[in-house]
Amino acid sequence: EEELQVIQPEKSVSVAAGESATLNCTATSLIPVGPIQWFRGVGPGRELIYSQKEGHFPRVTPVSDPTKRNNMDFSIRISNITPADAGTYYCVKFRKGSPDVELKSGAGTELSVRAKPSAPVVSGPAVRATAEHTVSFTCESHGFSPRDITLKWFKNGNELSDFQTNVDPAGKSVSYSIRSTARVVLTRRDVHSQVICEVAHVTLQGDPLRGTANLSEAIRVPPFLEVTQQSMRADNQVNVTCQVTKFYPQRLQLTWLENGNVSRTEMASALPENKDGTYNWTSWLLVNVSAHRDDVKLTCQVEHDGQPAVNKSFSVKVSAHPKEQGSNTAAENTGTNERDYKDDDDKHHHHHH
């Protein structure tokens, strides 16, 4: 009789996570009598996956009924495959004995598990930055196999090129993770902008996964300040307006100072949004000219999003307002629109308007 051979026809099998894997094995002879066992790996540390003779293997089913007469098909089906099941599986014939003796092994079948990447999670900077600054966004996805994966970054639909990507681990593993960091230069128009991390993998059938982050979480658009005086009213009161424009986020506190003394403090709330996502706010202060002997220095002080205050001063010339008259008002704008803030690279920017 011919010598028994154990045939594992497939060198490799690839299965999607969650599916069943069929590992084929046939013997070429009924002789010698004895059971088949399946192992993952070789050597003393090999793992028993299925034994025809004994044991409980809830996820493994023999493809052919083991009690079938003259059975030489020892293929098995492993259910609910996970990346942890990846490895090389050996079908091993034993000769009946006390105990049974290992006789011959098949050549092995490598099981690779196709596992989908997790939904990409995009995280932005911990602190906000202003226009012209570069911020970093990180995208992470885990648990995929095989290792080959493609990651792209987009800002408002335009592909970005300034990013660095790593896939870990570098060596062989049951599953892999990807981490990519993109550098994005902010502009004042980015409140409504979005960055998208797109991951393509063989398991996704051409339908990539996307993770997004809104630049509104990363950007701060400092306000412009303008203080103006309306015409004198008949009751000797001057209406001074502080216009705070094009700022984001909404978190803003405005304080009026009269000759350096706090007159009123207001907090911005429920402001309508501009088309570009920024906000405007206007505050008025009525100054009773007749109550002052000297010129009044008004300061509109704005503290935006926890940053150092920005001041805009304005002098109301009392001498220009005869107490008995309600016309020919004159005022002089002596202030500067100082927009000071300290940013990441420690430079000071001074804007004068």
Partner: antibody, heavy 119, light 110 residues
Framework: QVQLVQSGAEVKKPGASVKVSCKAS????????INWVRQAPGQGLEWIAM????????HYNQIFKDRATLTTDTSTSTAYMELRSLRSDDTAVYYC????????????WGRGTLVTVSS | DIVLTQSPDSLAVSLGERATINCRAS??????????IFWYQQKPGQPPKLLIY???NLDSGVPDRFSGSGSGTDFTLTISSLQAEDVAVYYC????????FGQGTKLEIK
Amino acid sequence: QVQLVQSGAEVKKPGASVKVSCKASGYTFTNYWINWVRQAPGQGLEWIAMIDPSDSETHYNQIFKDRATLTTDTSTSTAYMELRSLRSDDTAVYYCAMDYGSLYAMDYWGRGTLVTVSS
Amino acid sequence: DIVLTQSPDSLAVSLGERATINCRASKSVSSSGYNYIFWYQQKPGQPPKLLIYLASNLDSGVPDRFSGSGSGTDFTLTISSLQAEDVAVYYCQHSRDLPTFGQGTKLEIK
């Protein structure tokens, strides 16, 4: 180590029934056929029937088809052979045997159960 | 049904001598290149023990003085050099279809 442990000896009256048990250990009970064979005193071996514990498929020797019933309890890995309408010539040692190679052979045997039918 | 006839019914052989037992089937027990004949040894008060499977293959733990041969309908069990512990009754069995046994051959020492 494969072991088949059979129930103890029985004495029965003609016309009665007997149920012999065979408890298997040391292997996966549902993966191998169980055969039943009997041997009358001083006589040869006579095959009665076989059962597949995984699905209770059975094959009977025509001589015993109407009187013998094979069953299994997979929860306890036990096979049973019931023989009805006993006659004196049913006096014999009844063996269970496991087929390890699915060749319809008998690789491992129990020690036997003596059933005596006498009025 | 296939009937198996063993010969002789009994046999006496000197220690160290060859013992030969024959088994003839009423029709071929061969299928797919295999001969479905099995040989058993039964000693007094013990269950039978499988010696040979598929006509010529020695079961685990069986001394190699035992051998089996034959094909189709005619089969032989040979003990090349009889030992005292070989005294027993020997049975052939087929499984070409449902199993049957031969009537047995009693082997004694001369």
